[in-house]
């Protein structure tokens, strides 16, 4: 139970203005209205408000939306967000961007809060989908978004979305997660011609099965060597030496330098060491001559 | 079921008190807004007042400042209305209403207490 | 304070006619903080209309409302009836919550 104290004589708010910030703590509690405050929303985040101030704003919208904020007051939190909690912004129902976007600019330059992430939470619920200018919202604001997702929640990432999708965007995303991405990104890129399409879906490539890469080697693409190195092990292992030679092109020369790292490493065991040798780059380590080798995996199969 | 039920209505002589009390019941009574409206005989609905549920943060007419005190009893699910210094011109039936603050509207009414201020 | 004005102050129509009643503010409401009320003699008011278009619970469609700014309208399409009753509009935005001074909509 709140401890109930008159407003002075002279002191009731009659609207919200700057002369509220010499209030007191028990003088804003006992003399703003939230439905007042409701309806002004606007002009909080131009006064200065004390830290215990906002506390006690936040307290009447509470008093006066105790089932969670209506959006029209949510829109204009501006500062007041940073005193939600993710329990208060499960009751919300976020459905306009722009409202989103008004709450991303207060956290900007901020990691990801738990608030942040319980209102991306809400609003994507909302929306049942991650669509195109929502994606484009929040990569923009937060580029490691896309990757924070699990497979489950990238799933209902449509196709067209994929535009939206920047090359830093896929940095820190997870062979799991580009297993989910990649076949969206090749649904969405389909009516490109082959060059265009490469530079498209270059950042994608974490996803792909062989059968892509080796479809990709009859290109001329020239896929440089970081994105190789993202490559799936497992979808590297039966190119030929001469599909990743045509796959690189120029860039194969790298390969030198990547010897001891998997895919590579795990590559090159695969190889037929004279077929190596072709590369005139000393890559050793592979099948040597006279070898016979068994594919196990189709052995298991057959049994 | 929402129902709200005013009492304490009556006759009371000019310069008088009188306290209208509102029972509510059907809602969740600590977590509302609640207000009293008034309507002088053959005229139109006047706003007299509202009161907050945790804070009681208080607002009035211009027409009863000073004279009137709104208050509640959220232990008991009661709105009161304290009228003092009363009036011919207070001669009125009091409403007691729900504010709805998502319709931002007043959404249950009680059936009202009729309050006759005369010599 | 907000001073709201309503127009007519009487209306007469026939059942089955369309009802427009008017409310004018003296100063601009955001549509979400503009309500009607019916009345009916001898009855408590009733919300009709809520953030000036939005129908309350239990509302029949021919009731509807549009307006913004300083300007709202309350419309029966085809009057019942029941629908033979005082109607008030009243702001929220600023204290006091002042109510128009309401249309009458009386049998012709």
């Known amino acids: 139970e709140v401890e109930k104290t008159a407003c002075p004589s002279g002191k009731k708010a009659r609207e919200i203005d700057e002369s509220l910030i010499f209030y007191k703590k028990w003088e804003l509690e006992a003399c703003v209205d939230a439905a007042l405050l409701a309806t002004q929303m606007d002009r909080v985040n131009a006064i200065p408000f004390t830290y215990e101030q906002l506390d006690v704003l936040k307290h009447k919208l509470d008093e006066l939306y105790p089932q969670g904020y209506p959006e029209s007051v949510i829109q204009h939190l501006g500062y007041l967000f940073l005193k939600m909690s993710p329990e208060d912004i499960r009751k919300w129902n976020v459905t306009s961007l722009e409202t989103l976007k008004a709450l991303l600019e207060v956290n900007k330059g901020h990691e990801m809060s738990p608030q942040v992430a319980t209102l991306i939470d809400r609003f994507v619920k909302g929306r049942g989908q991650l669509d195109k200018d929502t994606l484009d919202t929040l990569t923009a604001f937060y580029p490691g978004y896309l990757c924070s997702l699990s497979p489950e929640e990238l799933s209902s990432v449509p196709p067209s979305s994929i535009w939206a999708v920047r090359p830093q965007d896929l940095d820190t995303c997870d062979p799991r997660q580009l297993d989910v991405l990649y076949p969206k990104a090749r649904l969405a890129f389909q009516n490109m011609n082959g060059s265009e399409y490469f530079v498209k879906i270059q950042s994608f490539l974490g996803g792909a099965p062989t059968e892509d890469l080796k479809a990709l080697s009859q290109q001329n693409v020239s896929m440089d060597l970081a994105t190789f190195m993202k490559l799936r092990t497992d979808a590297v292992l039966p190119l030929t030496v001469a599909e990743v030679q045509k796959l690189l092109g120029p860039h194969v020369e790298g390969l030198k330098a990547e010897e001891r790292h998997r895919p590579v490493r795990d590559w090159i065991l695969r190889q037929r060491q004279d077929d190596l040798d072709t590369l005139g780059l000393g890559l050793q380590g592979g099948i040597p001559n006279g070898y016979l080798v068994l594919d196990l995996s189709m052995q298991e199969a057959l049994s | 079921e929402v129902q709200l039920l005013e009492s304490g209505g009556g006759l009371v002589q000019p310069g008088g008190s009188l306290r209208l009390s509102c029972a509510a019941s059907?809602?969740?009574?600590?977590?509302?807004?609640m207000s009293w409206v008034r309507q002088a005989p053959g005229k139109g609905l006047e706003w007299v007042s509202n009161i907050s549920p945790t804070y009681s943060t208080t607002n009035y007419a211009d027409s009863v400042k000073g004279r009137f005190t709104i208050s509640r009893d959220n232990s008991k699910n009661t709105l009161y209305l304290q009228m003092n210094s009363l009036r011919a011109e207070d001669t009125a039936v009091y409403y007691c209403a729900r504010y709805n603050a998502y319709q931002i509207g007043l959404d249950y009414w009680g059936q009202g207490t009729l309050v006759t201020v005369s010599s | 304070e907000i001073v709201l004005t309503q127009s007519p102050g009487t209306l007469s129509l026939s059942p089955g006619e369309r009802a427009t009643l008017s409310c004018r503010a003296s100063?601009?409401?955001?549509?979400?903080?503009l309500a009607w009320y019916q009345q009916k003699p001898g009855q408590a008011p009733r919300l009709l209309i809520y953030?000036?278009?939005s129908r309350a619970t239990g509302i029949p469609d021919r009731f509807s409302g549009s307006g913004s700014g300083t300007d709202f309208t309350l419309t029966i399409s085809r009057l019942e009836p029941e629908d033979f009753a005082v109607y008030y509009c009243?702001?929220?935005?600023?204290?006091?919550?002042?109510f128009g001074q309401g249309t009458k909509v009386e049998i012709k």
């Open positions: 059907g809602f969740t009574f600590t977590q509302t807004y």
């Open positions: 009243q702001q929220a935005l600023g204290y006091p919550h002042t």
């Open positions: 953030g000036a278009s």
């Open positions: 100063q601009s409401v955001s549509s979400s903080y």
